[in-house]
């Protein structure tokens, strides 16, 4: 199995740790881990281009999209590789994510692994939305916090 | 500029059919979530249907399922509705919007009256 | 089902007046809140998405804001053209629905 892990930062007080593994090289990858400080409700989850946090998040670059894809939503198939999807975030700021997803991988075309995970400030709207940018980012809003993908032993 | 444009309302006797287009422009048309919203004379909106861009998904409001169906034909940068088993209380003026769950651009409507 | 709770439904006020419309659910909806305003014999229009997003050419006397169940659409400065029906509108539930419409008239 390969195994990955992400520690997420912001300017703020969201933070996290993620954590990824994939038992064989084309199967699904299994993402889980606890980001805290957010606000109650929903938050986009992407991975982002550029494994570059140089000026913060901002420069992490658009999603992760190898594929020239619209933006859309996990399950579907118009989608960037990094749209993961949203995280919920309860009453007390902690959001628990437990996902597995077939269309990331942490070796390949489609590999994660040195690309910077984001949690956005607002709900993705998954592609649904009535403008341009709803099949570009979601329309999820400014980037709270961020990190790296690293392998993990 | 994008245009939305809806043709096909009229007069239609309870238990009639109409069918609804949109023409689009100015937009990539094949990329975007439609829907179709109406609102009944002096009342309120409320969203009607909608369709996801490649046509593979659609969802409906309870008061329509089973009556109405919405498709595309993303060749011709089309939206229609098709409206079945007519009922008085789907007199409404029937726009098409941009967007699946909310909604960008609107079209100028198309008024249809179910009365007999 | 969302309920949605728009108030109040008119408000009369002068040019050059703040304005607030409130908009209640029935539960949570996340960020999922989008604000329209009609004109008579118009279609609706959007000002703002996902609670707080100003619509592209929408001026910036408007602001959105809230979060969970209250939500708040401001005009800073009431302009003539802005006197209008205002409508908030939750996408995060199927089916998706408006509140009820706040008339918006000249005092």
């Known amino acids: 199995a390969t195994k990955a892990v992400c520690v997420l930062k912001g300017d703020g007080p969201v933070q996290g740790i993620i954590n990824f593994e994939q038992k064989e090289s084309n199967g699904p990858v299994k993402v889980w881990g606890s980001i805290k400080g957010l606000t109650e409700g929903l938050h986009g989850f992407h991975v982002h281009e550029f494994g570059d946090n140089t000026a913060g998040c901002t420069s992490a670059g658009p999603h992760f999209n190898p594929l020239s894809r619209k933006h859309g939503g996990p399950k579907d198939e118009e989608r960037h590789v990094g749209d993961l999807r949203n995280v919920t975030a309860d009453k007390d700021g902690v959001a628990d994510v437990s996902i597995e997803d077939s269309v990331i991988s942490l070796s390949g075309d489609h590999c994660i692994i040195g690309r910077t995970l984001v949690v956005h400030e607002k709900a993705d709207d998954l592609g649904k939305g009535g403008n341009e940018e709803s099949t570009k980012t979601g329309n999820a809003g400014s980037r709270l916090a961020c990190g790296v993908i690293g392998i993990a032993q | 500029e994008v245009q939305l444009v809806e043709s096909g309302g009229g007069l239609v006797q309870p238990g009639g059919s109409l069918r609804l287009s949109c023409a689009a422009s100015g937009f990539t048309f094949s990329s975007f979530w439609m829907s179709w919203v109406r609102q009944a004379p002096g009342k309120g909106l409320e969203w009607v249907a909608n369709i996801k861009h490649d046509g593979s998904e659609q969802d409906y409001v309870d008061s329509v399922k089973g009556r109405f169906t919405i498709s595309r034909d993303n060749a011709k940068n089309s939206l229609y509705l098709q409206m079945n088993s007519l009922r008085a209380e789907d007199t409404a003026v029937y726009y098409c919007a941009r967007g699946g769950i909310w909604f960008g651009p609107w079209g100028q409507g198309t008024l249809v009256t179910v009365s007999s | 089902v969302i309920w949605m709770t728009q108030s109040p439904s008119l408000l009369s006020a002068s040019t050059g007046d703040r304005v607030t419309i409130s908009c209640r659910m029935s539960?949570?909806?996340?960020?999922?809140l989008a604000w329209y305003q009609q004109k008579p014999g118009k279609a609706p229009e959007v000002l703002i998405y996902a609670v707080s997003t100003l619509q592209s050419g929408v001026p910036s006397r408007f602001s959105g804001s809230g979060s969970g169940t209250d939500f708040t659409l401001t005009i800073s400065c009431l302009q003539s053209e802005d006197f209008a029906t205002y409508y908030c509108?939750?996408?995060?539930?199927?089916?998706?629905?408006f509140g009820q419409g706040t008339k918006l008239e000249i005092k």
């Open positions: 509108q939750q996408y995060y539930s199927f089916p998706y629905t």
């Open positions: 539960q949570g909806i996340s960020s999922y």
